[in-house]
Interface confidence: low
């Protein structure tokens, strides 16, 4: 039998008819043990359906009588066998038995899908003792039944070393359409298909399903669940839903936008973090993505020098993290740097410019054509040399560094001389003679002291020697400074 | 009828968190977002963000992560929304309001408003 | 984010005037997602409009909508008292949702 359970539904009388033996008339139980607190259920079923053969399990007890007769089999009289209900609503059934009195603690347990039911269920036992056996009601109710009620529920009962089985009662709880798949979020590229999933069960089963796309429904006829809604292809951002119907209602899945691929907006508040004299360390923040992610990120550097050539220097970098340091650049020199970044459809465009400088370097090569001689007559050494190229001083000359070195036998002394930015030579006292003397000249800028020239070496004589020739730092290509004595 | 009922108003000191409740009934409590709307004194109106009560999924404006929390009680049909670390420019009425499922997206119902005031 | 700049800020009308506040957004937005709300004082805001030019349940056919792209009117035909409110325009296109600064009419 099936019965549906619905809200004008009247409670069945708990005993439709008596069982074997006086029971009283109020059917007020002797004895009732309850398993938790019960709640008044909505609904009930009779623990009796006459006029069916039996299916459980059966015992035959072995005890007799004086008289030697056997007594009839145990079996759970016949119940309901399958109830349909809807979500939140309350159901109550029972199993019953009647039970000689020959038999002592005799338990009923409940079992649903074959697993014993315990803890806090809502299971009440009555005993109703005659003079030769005893009814026992067992009865399970659910005040607010959930999906996951439903399924098979049985009664045992051990006697004697047997297990009686009730017939299992299937409680059918139904509700609106449950999704177990709803459509997702994407981001397509323009005029490309795509498929898009929803799923919905019940009870009740058929699930139909329709498709909506911005408020509007797609297919005039529902597909059975599941669906696939393939979708030719979009030029403009959609929003998609899905629709489940059964015969209790409609569930609306979350609406999902699906986005349209688009290059990049172009990168933002492109700021300089930091300064140094050949290279500069930028950060950006990026631009909306275009739905897609960013691959990578093009920094563009030209000269803001009005007589520069205009030529730009390209840095290719990852997207992340939004930073770089770009190298190679010119001490004491203005640039114009933009960023862009690309996704899979392409280049965004760039960002606002932006002005930076380097800052002062020291000197990047030293001063050329170092010469040295002896003007023995005033006992001095002469140094002469050129400034090195005004673009590779990497800022203003504040000055020149002299290294000079003499070496005797056993002796060696380094002296240091710091000499004006406008001079081009100077003059320094020998030291020591019967010596060889090195000298080696750098320039210095603010931004520190820049490579030491080559060392030139000339002989200082003991006194009373005449040399007029000069030492000087070799021609290119020649790989030791030559000594002229 | 569809009906969207807040909580009390708040007065809450600098620092602070406050929460507020939104009870819904006459719908399906699951099956529409709800979303938070706040209004300060004179100005207009500000969305913070909503909550998909069926599986908790929320968006948020930037403005607002991670001082703001939505949750629901899907038992009592309730929407919640805390806001903590509180200023005085929080000082406004807050609004839940029902969002129209398909993102396309407004607003078809809305609580009475519940106002928090934040002040030393 | 998108932002919308609504025109005027205030205005006075008499009854039986016709009323014409715009609401300009800062990127195209489709007409589906363009939306109207009336606040009266005190009240909470209330649903006027939807989808440019939908009238929500229960509101009066002297309201109406139009627009497209970034330009969005609402249109009170033969103003009356309990018009007095403030107009707000709203899109729904993307996160963060925005609405307008409001428009408050006075009735004379």
């Known amino acids: 039998a099936i019965t549906e359970a619905r809200e004008e539904a009247k409670p069945y009388p708990l005993f439709p008819g008596p069982f074997p033996g006086s029971l009283q008339t109020d059917h007020t139980p002797l004895l009732s043990l309850p398993h938790a607190s019960g709640y008044q259920p909505a609904l009930m079923f009779s623990p009796t359906q006459p006029g069916r053969p039996h299916t459980g399990n059966v015992a035959i007890p072995q005890v007799t009588s004086v008289e030697s007769k056997p007594l009839p089999p145990l079996a759970f009289k016949h119940t309901v066998g399958h109830i349909i209900l809807s979500e939140h609503k309350g159901v109550k059934f029972n199993c019953s038995i009647s039970v000689p009195n020959i038999y002592q603690d005799t338990t009923i347990s409940w079992w649903k899908d074959g697993k014993e039911l315990l803890g806090a269920h809502h299971a009440i036992t009555q005993f109703y003792p005659d003079d030769e056996v005893t009814a026992i009601i067992a009865s399970f109710s659910i005040t607010s039944v959930q999906r996951s009620d439903n399924g098979s529920y049985i009664c045992k009962m051990k006697i004697n070393n047997e297990e009686i089985v009730s017939d299992p009662i299937y409680i059918e709880v139904q509700g609106l359409p449950h999704f177990t798949k709803q459509p997702e979020s994407m981001n397509v590229t323009r005029n490309t298909a795509f498929n898009l999933t929803c799923q919905a069960v019940g009870p009740p089963e058929p699930v139909n399903i329709f498709w909506v796309q911005n408020s509007s429904r797609v297919n005039e006829q529902p597909e059975k669940s599941p669906s696939v809604l393939t979708v030719p292809g979009l030029t403009e951002m959609a929003v998609f839903s899905c629709e489940a119907h059964n015969d209790k209602g409609l569930t609306v899945s979350k609406g999902v936008q699906i986005n349209i691929k688009a290059i990049p907006s172009p990168p933002t508040e492109v700021s300089i973090r930091n300064s140094t004299a050949h290279s500069i360390l930028i950060s950006w923040v990026p631009g909306f993505d275009g739905y897609s992610p960013f691959r990578n990120c093009s920094i563009q550097v030209k000269e803001a020098d009005p007589l520069s050539n205009g030529s730009v220097m390209i840095f290719n970098t990852s997207a992340l993290p939004h930073l770089y340091q770009i190298k190679q650049l010119q001490a004491l020199a203005n640039y114009s740097i933009g960023v862009s970044c690309m996704n899979e459809i392409g280049w965004s465009a760039v960002s606002p410019w932006i002005l930076a400088s380097t800052t002062e370097g020291a000197p990047s090569v030293a001063p050329l054509n170092v010469t040295v001689f002896l003007n023995e007559s005033s006992d001095n050494v002469d140094i002469r040399w050129m400034k090195p190229p005004t673009k590779q001083q990497d800022g203003e000359l504040v000055g020149y560094r002299i290294s000079h070195v003499w070496q005797s036998a056993g002796i060696s002394k380094e002296l240091l001389e710091e000499v004006g930015q406008n001079g081009s030579r100077a003059r320094i006292s020998v030291q020591v003679h019967n010596a060889t003397c090195t000298v080696r000249i750098a320039a210095v800028t603010r931004g520190g002291v820049g490579p030491f020239s080559d060392p030139v070496k000339i002989f200082i004589p003991a006194h009373g020697w005449v040399d007029y020739a000069p030492s000087s730092t070799p021609a290119p290509g020649n790989a030791d400074p030559v000594l002229i004595i | 009828q569809v009906q969207l009922v807040q909580s009390g108003a708040e007065v809450k000191k600098p620092g602070a968190s406050v929460k507020v409740s939104c009870k819904a009934s006459?719908?399906?409590?699951?099956?529409?977002?709800i979303n938070w709307v706040r209004q300060a004194p004179g100005q207009g109106l500000e969305w913070m963000g909503w909550?998909?009560?069926?599986?908790?999924?929320?968006k948020y404006n930037e403005k607002f992560k991670g001082r703001v929390t939505m949750t629901t009680d899907t038992s009592t049909s309730t929407a919640y929304m805390e806001l903590r670390s509180l200023r005085s420019d929080d000082t406004a009425v807050y609004y839940c309001a029902r969002g129209y499922y398909d993102n396309l997206y407004y607003f078809d119902y809305w609580g009475q408003g519940t106002t928090v005031t934040v002040s030393s | 984010e998108i932002v919308l700049t609504q025109s005027p800020d205030f205005q006075s009308v008499t009854p039986k005037e016709k009323v014409t506040i715009t609401c300009s957004a800062s990127s195209i937005i489709s007409s589906n997602y363009f939306h109207w709300y009336q606040q009266k004082p005190d009240q909470s805001p209330k649903l006027l409009i939807k989808?440019?030019?939908n009238l929500a349940s229960g509101v009066p056919s002297r309201f109406s909508g139009s627009g497209s792209g970034t330009d969005y009117t609402l249109t009170i035909n033969s103003l009356e008292a309990e018009d007095a409110a403030t107009y707000y325009c709203q899109q729904g296109r993307s996160v963060p949702l925005t609405f307008g600064q409001g428009t408050k009419l006075e009735i004379k």
């Open positions: 989808r440019t030019s």
């Open positions: 006459g719908y399906t409590f699951t099956t529409y977002d």
């Open positions: 909550i998909y009560p069926r599986d908790g999924y929320t």
